[in-house]
Interface confidence: medium
């Protein structure tokens, strides 16, 4: 696969991952109540997220409450907020860095420095994935720990919510995408012969024999 193809695929994965991370960050389903006592008639389900908690009635009616005070929040929620939002914002920065270093854009002049910019974009996305992974795993650890804690009442036990799964999928996409972007740029820094001349009109590569794309000429 050529460096440009790796670049495009990596960027697409990172964008999907970024979208997934924003979704996971906003969804209230980080923790959902687990009903293990079958004698209890499930009247309602409780969801807990980073920004709000929701109660869903068996009728389908949902009532959500945004957390009032930051100070009243647990340390893990505050840390998860900070890390997840940081990851989302950093991914936004990474997007511009990646686009600047992309072979099909002109905002950074072609030349050796451009490969380094592309590599930086990939590394930033990789870091975004790792940054987002911390609160997700932290929350998952709390859920598991409390679930198996005999002191936790049965009706107060939580299990993994959809947001955690979306978040994990998003971090996987960010890290894989970041790796592909790094590979695309690394292919070029390590194997300059694979960094073909860029045709901004229609990104294509010359043939191995050194013939140039005729579209490039007037």
């Amino acid at each position: 696969m050529g460096s440009a193809a790796l670049e495009i695929l990596g960027l697409v994965l990172c964008l999907v991952g970024w979208g997934g991370l924003i979704l996971a960050c906003g969804l209230p389903m980080w923790q959902v109540t687990a009903f293990l006592d079958h004698n209890i008639v499930t009247a309602q389900t409780t969801w807990k997220g980073l920004w709000m908690s929701c109660v869903v009635q068996s009728t389908g009616h949902m009532q959500c409450k945004v957390y009032d005070s930051v100070l009243a929040l647990s340390t893990e929620v505050q840390a998860a907020r900070a890390l997840t939002v940081s990851a989302v914002l950093l991914a936004f920065v990474a997007l511009f860095v990646t686009l600047a270093g992309a072979q099909c854009t002109t905002c950074v002049a072609p030349g050796p420095a451009k490969a380094r910019v592309a590599l930086t974009g990939g590394v930033l996305y990789l870091f975004c994935g790792l940054l987002a992974l911390v609160p997700l795993c932290w929350f998952a650890n709390i859920v598991v720990r409390e679930f198996y804690d005999p002191m936790t009442p049965v009706n107060a036990r939580y299990e993994f919510g959809q947001a955690l799964y979306i978040g994990w999928a998003a971090t996987a996409l960010l890290m894989v995408g970041g790796c592909l972007l790094c590979c695309g740029a690394w292919v070029c820094t390590g194997r300059p012969d694979l960094s073909f001349p860029v045709k901004y009109s229609a990104p294509r590569r010359p043939t191995a024999t050194g013939d140039y794309d005729k579209k490039n000429y007037v």
């Epitope: 072609p110 030349g111 300059p192 012969d193 490039n216």
Partner: antibody, heavy 119, light 107 residues
Amino acid sequence: QVQLKESGPGLVQPSQTLSLTCTVSGLSLIRNSVSWIRQPPGKGLEWMGVIWSNGGTEYNSTVKSRLSISRDTSKNQVFLKMNSLQTEDSAMFFCARTPDGYYPYFDYWGQGVMVTVSS
Amino acid sequence: DIVLTQSPATLSVTPGESVSLSCRASQGISTSIHWYQQKSNESPRLLIRYASQSISRIPSRFSGSGSGTDFTLTINGVESEDLSVYYCQQSYNLPLTFGSGTKLEIK
């Protein structure tokens, strides 16, 4: 067919400014970069600078303070302006097509124009 | 700046024999080296790009190899028309730099 042709004065007075033009045919400057390279008599090649397809420029530090490269995309011309010329600046000046990419080289060259700096 | 050292400065060969021209970089530059041929009173001509990639319209007797700091241009079966100066050029870092050249003489 791709062609580059340099033009300008053959003789320049010391401390004066050199102005050269590279007229390009067969390719568009909007999608192609052009470098200037010089070669003093009996010596090797020295890259002076480039004007990229996006209009950005890069210069060799040895001439950066005295050199300016610009272009007119409508006329398909690239210009070199170099001030405070000295006798050691006497050289054959070439313009060359530089394919855009991370690692540039020169695939089409002009025939060159000889510039002598002398009073 | 990356310095390219070419050796030998002059090489005398008889037509038909094979020759190797050397270019050494002052630091690792992967495969971002390009070779040019300059005949007397002519402009340079690109022979090889990225250390080993051949260019169309260039005779197949010209080939390149190497990676890192050491590069070689090989001419298999030198012909009298190959009498020229050969330059290597790096594009790993700006400024782009050329070697001092190797002059090929025909015995």
